[in-house]
């Protein structure tokens, strides 16, 4: 069961996995649900009453019954890992500790204006994992100013201390808010010879990849194939590191791959969701629990509403026995990893769903694109809303995409002449505007985030959000699109859809069912030729055929210009404006969301 | 000792097209991350182009992206700027840089190896 309270002047007996400091239980909390064994936690905050070196101490706990024994203990803060919920978490922390020294290993010392350029530099840096910064009050004259960048073997403090006028944060890497090159590259036949940090067992190079991205001090990896020469080391994924963040070294050998840490790639990819099934590979670990099971992909159910369950492998029913049911193996260990990985046995292993909750929902496969046609079938843009007016009588009013699940983003220029939100219904999972009657159900606006310097579409910023009453519950048919992630800013995308219900030629009406044509993105310099009269702007992006006959019409509106890159789609234009509809050489003009990702985040994540 | 010898530079009139080269001794482009900066008449610093040599990934300034192309000889320790559909706005001082750890790869503050730098004059 979800339990994400915290309890006050509790304290979790016995259970312990390890310490970690960290500078509030919010975050204790977090670190216990990144953890592969953690269900429990105990934190002890500062307090008169308490020993100061135990004051921000984060002590994880584990229990087969899934809880322990509660005990009154004066500043202790207690409480469970989200592993237990379904809703979406992050490992992004924004918060500034004031008055806090989070220590580290102090590796960079340079003077910043401020804590939040400081942060800056740490989000910035791939050693980086928190900082401590001494703000101009600083009793010393030599360390005022100094922004001290910090790493550690875990990513969190090896120990908390108060000390008056430093303030201390955390990297924001794990917010997608990183400017570090995204180097997405798997390299064939290679080994890099650095230092290694770790090693951990894996079926392929991607798991082996992900694996990397999660774990603090990992910058690249080597993965040895199950075709390795060397036995003993098949499936092995060595995390490795070096002092420049680069592979030193690079050597060809047959049967290996390496590739690098995708920490600046975040909220563009899933990184702790391993979702394929290994076909004739056994997972070895310590077994939790045997069931029988109908299908590989039943015991993958199973392994994930188990919440200890990390692994698991499957082995199918020998002819008709059991009712054609086999044997499913819940597993886990110390790291998540299997110990070892067996080939040739006949099983079907795989890993628990659990943690894809700690993506962002919006990298989880969702139905493949159907080809050909221009009519779109459900599910399809599981995250294209229509948004409807009711003032004077209802209406199909613009597109919208959900990014969150309170939040559609669409454009500025749909809300002339809306005096106020609550004239606004969002529909999503909607195919046919047929299908939308009095009593289907809609999400009310509570409120229209405009962007400020929006004038008129042509001019940008046309680019609006839209705070929905209640959230959105993700299903199959309504569920969110990635925001570009500006580590992708140089991208070149080459499979871009636009969609929406508008109109399908100048003089026309709403379509009734959703509309999707594909089209290719021009370049901005491009497109400037195309519109003399009008500047182009960076915060622009163009699509469409030189030819004309596809594009954005009037009621496309707002929707989104989705395009897919390493099988995530990513909202890469909001429809803005155009010349006509489909005309030759008038490509459409979109919002480039990419240069607004910074606005979209204050926006939704203001307090 | 490291040296980045730009060569390349010139005049041309707008629309035309230039080729910068870097020579590096000193420094291996292999494996780091090597880019492309310019800085304008009374402007500061400005990252244009960059390429991690590995793999060859890419990266490129907003304002020259579908006009100018990054590419590098790892075998001759050359890194290339094809610059094509040239604007009188591209008129700059051009730089070749080199980094030495993981950086963001348009970022001039975070690369240690410089050259002299290159002239590009783009008249309209």
């Known amino acids: 069961e979800c339990v994400t309270q915290l309890l006050k002047d509790t304290c979790f007996e016995g259970g312990d996995i390890t310490t970690v400091f960290t500078p509030s239980a919010k975050y204790c909390q977090v670190v216990c649900t990144y953890h592969p064994r953690c269900l429990l936690f105990t934190f002890t905050a500062e307090s008169p009453s308490e020993d100061p070196t135990r004051w921000f101490t984060c002590v994880l706990k584990d229990s087969v019954t899934e809880t322990l024994p509660r005990v009154n203990r004066t500043a202790a803060i207690s409480g469970y890992s989200f592993k237990q919920c379904s809703h979406q978490i992050s490992a992004c922390n924004k918060d500034i500790y004031v008055d806090l020294d989070m220590k580290g290993i102090n590796y960079n010392s340079s003077v910043a204006k401020s804590a939040q350029e400081c942060q800056e530099r740490c989000t910035d840096d791939v050693h980086c994992h928190f900082f401590t910064y001494a703000t101009r009050q600083f009793p010393s004259l030599e360390h005022r100013n100094i922004c001290l960048l910090k790493h550690t073997q875990t990513g969190t403090p090896t120990r908390i201390t108060k000390l008056d006028k430093v303030v201390s944060g955390f990297s924001l890497k794990s917010c997608a808010l990183s400017n570090l090159a995204c180097i997405r590259d798997i390299f064939p036949n290679t080994v890099f010879a650095d230092s290694n940090i770790d090693s951990v067992m894996a079926p392929d190079a991607f798991v082996c990849g992900r694996i990397c991205t999660h774990h603090p001090g990992c910058l690249f990896f080597t993965f040895f194939s199950q075709e390795w020469p060397k036995e003993s080391q098949r499936n092995l994924c060595l995390l490795k590191t070096s002092e420049s963040g680069l592979p030193s070294t690079r050597i060809k050998k047959s049967k290996a791959l390496s590739g690098f840490s995708l920490q600046s790639c975040r909220h563009s990819i899933p990184v702790f969701c391993h979702s394929s099934f290994y076909h004739d590979t056994d997972f070895l670990g310590e077994e939790l629990d045997i069931v029988a099971a109908k299908s590989h992909e039943a015991c993958q159910k199973l392994c994930t509403n188990a919440v200890r369950c990390q692994f698991f492998t499957y082995t199918p029913a020998q002819a008709s026995c059991n009712e054609g049911k086999g044997k499913c193996y819940l597993k886990l260990s110390s790291n998540g990893s299997p110990t070892k990985i067996l080939h040739g046995r006949g099983g079907i292993s795989g890993y628990t769903l659990r943690l894809c909750k700690m993506d962002n929902e919006c990298t989880t496969k969702i139905k493949p694109r159907i080809v050909g046609g221009t009519a779109s079938v459900r599910g399809e843009w599981p995250w294209q809303v229509t948004l409807h007016t009711t003032s004077p009588t209802q209406r199909h009013l613009c597109g919208g995409s959900i990014i969150g699940n309170q939040w559609i983003l669409t454009a500025a220029h749909c809300f002339y002449g809306v005096e106020s939100p609550k004239i606004l219904r969002v529909y999503s999972g909607i195919l046919n505007q047929s299908e939308i009657k009095e009593d289907t159900s809609f999400f009310g606006v509570q409120e229209i985030i405009i962007h400020d310097q929006y004038k008129m579409a042509e001019s940008g910023y046309d680019i609006a959000l839209l705070k929905l009453e209640t959230t959105v519950n993700y299903t199959d048919s309504q569920r969110p699109i990635c925001l570009p992630s500006k580590g992708d800013r140089n991208v070149i995308y080459t499979d871009c859809w636009v969609t929406g219900w508008g109109y399908r030629k100048l003089r026309d009406k709403i379509q009734n069912t959703l509309q999707k044509a594909k089209i290719p993105l021009v370049t901005n310099e491009e497109c400037q030729k195309r519109y003399r009269g009008h500047k182009i702007t960076h915060k622009m992006i163009c699509a469409g055929y030189r030819e004309g006959g596809k594009d954005a019409c009037k009621g496309d509106s707002g929707g989104p210009l989705s395009c897919k890159h390493n099988e995530v789609w990513h909202l890469v234009g909001i429809t803005s404006w155009g010349e006509g509809c489909a005309q030759r050489e008038r490509p459409g003009v979109y919002t480039n969301v990419v240069e607004y990702v910074d606005w979209i985040l204050e926006k939704t994540q203001a307090v | 000792q490291v040296q980045l010898v730009e060569s390349g530079g010139g005049s041309v009139q707008a629309g035309g097209s230039l080729r910068l080269s870097c020579a590096a001794s000193g420094y291996t482009f292999n494996n780091n991350f090597v880019g492309w900066f310019r800085q304008a008449p009374g402007k500061g610093l400005e990252g244009v182009s960059a390429i991690y040599s590995l793999g060859g990934s890419t990266y490129y300034a907003d304002s020259v992206k579908g006009r100018f192309t990054i590419s590098r000889d790892n075998s001759k320790n050359t890194l290339y700027l094809q610059m094509n559909s040239l604007k009188p706005e591209d008129t700059a001082v051009y730089y070749c840089?080199?980094?030495?750890?993981?950086?963001?790869?348009?970022?001039?503050?975070?690369?240690?190896?410089w050259g002299q730098g290159t002239l590009v004059t783009v008249s309209s």
């Open positions: 840089a080199g980094a030495i750890t993981w950086v963001p790869p348009l970022s001039h503050r975070r690369y240690t190896y």
